[in-house]
């Protein structure tokens, strides 16, 4: 560690005095100290001498000697007071900048340690300090305002009592900067804008920050717009607002608008798109297929997306038949707004009944006119089967009628014994009817098909079964010939609760 001569922590001299500070180290040494005039520096190998033959109050301060080659970075210091009866303060800075909650050191160095008892800190023009200003004093360093607040950004003076009167230092400006967490917060409204050519429009870009030092601008398709800025301060934040007012929009006003704000922490930007159209529009669409098939008893939500400008003047869901004149219950119709110009309308159809199959239409109206979107809802049913014995053209025939949706397929089985349903072990013969006759096939109704099985002789200890199936399920009917005539056996009671 270097050694300073004189080997005292502080030295008090009078103005005009000669002062010599000598530093000796193992290697070359260097001096650092407050910016001050009149010093002469002599360096010779491992020693360095600071000297002045005309000390002034401006030489007051701490002088530190270091050894650049010392890996431990040791240093020695001496504090010099030049006690000028006319100049109690040596002020080392015009301004002090700190962040909020840091200690702010105002570097008024007392030129005479004897004056320490009578020092105080004031605001310029003799104004007292703000309430809750917590400060301390060091004759070597000056006044420290502890945990400085933004509101304490003021011009200060250091005061010392000399011969019963207060002598002020030159002023020091304290700037307490807000700790800026990041770039300014931004809003750009609206998030999307549509106007018909000739209408008025407004776009508002606003930015806010805890610190006033930030910039904000609005640009259209990368061109910065010259818009007057409104400034405000509330909720402890500075706000800057740019409002673009367009009295009569035209196609050149359309495009991308970006609100950009920046400060020392960085930049934020947000964008919106402005569409200018020739006339009102109303577009209906659905992500669903307009032809819907649902199993009876299940539920369905029909969804329509609406894109419109100007806004809707009316809308409703309508049932167009064919089964009844009932209309969807309003409570089952739901509207959600995705954004200003896009909406979703949902019709909920829970536990569908046979009478609810048919066409559902969503109608909407705005100044651009009416639009409609129609869904066709067909219900799916498992097959219902019945078998009768009859004679056709003199031949004994089993006639199977199957009704369901989608159209059922028919299979005949002949099996031994009397049974409600043929199982694999009993089956004697199987006939598939690939093309049963379609008896009825109307939109939104079940499809009824008929299959004929010509039987020359009915075997009395056997069962004839007609089975029908489709994508929903299957049904069957067992026919058991008996000596007194034919006996038919439907399957167990088919329970259906819509």
């Amino acid at each position: 560690i270097p050694v300073i001569e004189p080997s005292v922590p502080e030295l008090v001299v009078k103005p005009g005095a000669t002062v010599t500070l000598r530093c000796v180290g193992n290697g070359s040494v260097e001096w650092d100290g407050p910016p001050s005039p009149h010093w002469t520096l002599y360096s010779d190998g491992s020693s360095s001498i600071l000297s002045t033959n005309n000390a002034t109050f401006q030489n007051t301060g701490t002088y530190r000697c270091t050894e650049p080659g010392d890996p431990l970075g040791g240093s020695a210091a001496i504090h010099l007071y030049v006690k000028d009866p006319a100049r109690p303060w040596n002020v080392l800075a015009q301004e002090v900048v700190v962040f909020e909650d840091q200690d702010a050191l105002l570097p008024c160095l007392l030129t005479d340690p004897v004056l320490e008892a009578g020092v105080s800190l004031v605001r310029v023009r003799g104004r007292p300090l703000m309430r809750h200003t917590n400060y301390s004093f060091s004759p070597w360093h000056g006044f420290t305002i502890h945990r400085a607040k933004f509101i304490q950004s003021q011009d200060y003076q250091c005061s010392a009592l000399m011969g019963g009167r207060k002598v002020m230092s030159i002023s020091i400006r304290l700037k307490v900067q807000k700790v800026i967490p990041g770039p300014p917060a931004l809003t750009l409204v609206p998030a999307e804008l549509v106007r018909i050519r000739g209408e008025a429009a407004q776009i508002v870009c606003s930015a806010s920050s805890v610190d006033v030092n930030f910039d904000v601008f609005l640009q259209h398709n990368n061109t910065k717009l010259a818009i007057p800025q409104q400034s405000d301060f509330h909720n402890n934040r500075y706000q800057k607002v740019l409002t673009l007012n367009l009295d009569q929009v035209d196609f050149q006003h359309a495009g991308n608008y970006s609100c950009v704000a920046s400060n020392v922490q960085g930049k934020h930007s947000t964008s919106m798109f402005f569409r200018v159209v020739e006339s009102a529009y109303l577009n209906l669409s659905s992500e669903q297929n307009l032809i819907q098939e649902v199993t009876v008893g299940e539920g369905l939500n029909l969804k329509v997306m609406v894109e419109a400008y100007p806004g809707l003047q009316g809308f409703n869901w309508t049932y167009l038949g064919p089964f009844s004149d009932h209309q969807p219950e309003p409570k089952l119709a739901n509207a959600t707004t995705k954004d200003t110009y896009r909406h979703t309308f949902t019709l909920s159809l829970p536990r569908l009944k046979p009478s609810e199959a048919g066409r559902y239409s969503f109608l909407a109206r705005n100044p651009g006119g009416w639009r409609a979107l129609t869904f066709e809802l067909t219900l799916r049913y498992p097959p219902e089967v019945s078998v009768i014995w009859t004679f056709i053209n003199g031949s004994g025939t089993l006639l199977c009628a199957a009704s369901g949706y989608p159209q059922p397929n028919v299979t005949w089985l002949q099996c031994s014994g009397h049974t409600d349903r043929c199982d694999e072990a009993q089956v004697l013969q199987v006939w598939d009817d690939p093309y049963p006759e379609v008896l009825s096939q109307e939109p939104f109704h079940k499809v009824t098909v008929q299959s004929l099985l010509t039987v020359e002789t009915l075997e009395h200890n056997q069962t004839y079964e007609c089975r029908a199936h489709n994508s929903v399920g299957s049904g069957s009917w067992a026919f058991i010939p008996i000596s007194a005539g034919a006996h038919t056996h439907p399957p167990d009671e088919f329970l259906f609760t819509p």
Partner: antibody
Framework: QVQLQESGPGLVKPSETLSLTCTVS????????WSWLRQPPGKGLEWIGY???????NYNPSLKSRVTISVDTSKNQFSLELSSVTAADTAVYYC???????????WGQGTTVTVSS | EIVLTQSPGTLSLPPGERATLSCRAS???????LAWYHQKPGQAPRLLIY???SRATGIPDRFSGSGSGTDFTLTISRLEPEDFAVYYC?????????FGQGTKVEIK
């Protein structure tokens, strides 16, 4: 050894604020004075101001009304803000260690800032 | 503020020659607070001399400084190819710190 590195945007629009940061490595920012200087294209050097680690600052009077220099000892950085810039502020900006008795003994490599719309 | 005026504006010399650069102050400058720098194109300035006559670390002894009061001189005893650059004097004893306008030393 002590090294300084300037950083910040190379292009600033007129009337906006120029912000630069100088990162110090190889020395504690808490020991010395640290200066900002600039050099317009083809011209000489102009001192902007210096700061001590405690936040004490002296500015060039010609720029004082537009300049703020601050220090962040936790990051070993000091910063320059120059407000309301014009084309006349286009320059290479340097940071330097500023020593009472030895002049500016360590410099950053400089960063070019252009003021243009 | 202290104004520093350097002369000549440009000095054209061949390598190996002696170069003498002058810096004049508008008011007294303590020799402790006068420095010389040189700057090559595209580079930052580099400290050559501090305290009017002390060489900075790593500066060859062909560079020397002298002077006091208002007149200061930088001498390069034998110009090397790497010495062709712009040279600035600076005072750092009073605020604001000021620089001379520079002397360009070019190869003749």
């Amino acid at each position: 050894q002590v090294q300084l590195q300037e950083s910040g945007p190379g292009l600033v629009k007129p009337s906006e604020t120029l912000s630069l940061t100088c990162t110090v490595s190889g020395a504690s920012i808490s020991t010395y004075f640290w200066s900002w200087l600039r050099q317009p294209p083809g011209k000489g050097l102009e001192w902007i101001g210096y700061i001590f680690y405690s936040g004490s600052i002296n500015y060039n009077p010609s720029l004082k009304s537009r300049v703020t220099i601050s220090v962040d000892t936790s990051k070993n950085q000091f910063s320059l803000e120059l407000s309301s810039v014009t084309a006349a502020d286009t320059a290479v900006y340097y940071c330097a260690r500023d020593r009472t008795f030895y002049g500016m003994d360590v410099w950053g490599q400089g960063t070019t800032v252009t003021v243009s719309s | 503020e202290i104004v520093l005026t350097q002369s000549p504006g440009t000095l054209s010399l061949p390598p190996g020659e002696r170069a003498t650069l002058s810096c004049r102050a508008s008011q007294n400058v303590s020799s402790t607070y006068l420095a010389w720098y040189h700057q090559k194109p595209g580079q930052a300035p580099r400290l050559l001399i501090y305290g009017a006559s002390s060489r900075a670390t790593g500066i060859p002894d062909r560079f020397s400084g002298s002077g006091s009061g208002t007149d200061f001189t930088l001498t390069i005893s034998r110009l090397e190819p790497e010495d062709f650059a712009v040279y600035y004097c600076q005072q750092y004893g009073s605020s604001p710190r000021t620089f001379g306008q520079g002397t360009k030393v070019e190869i003749k």
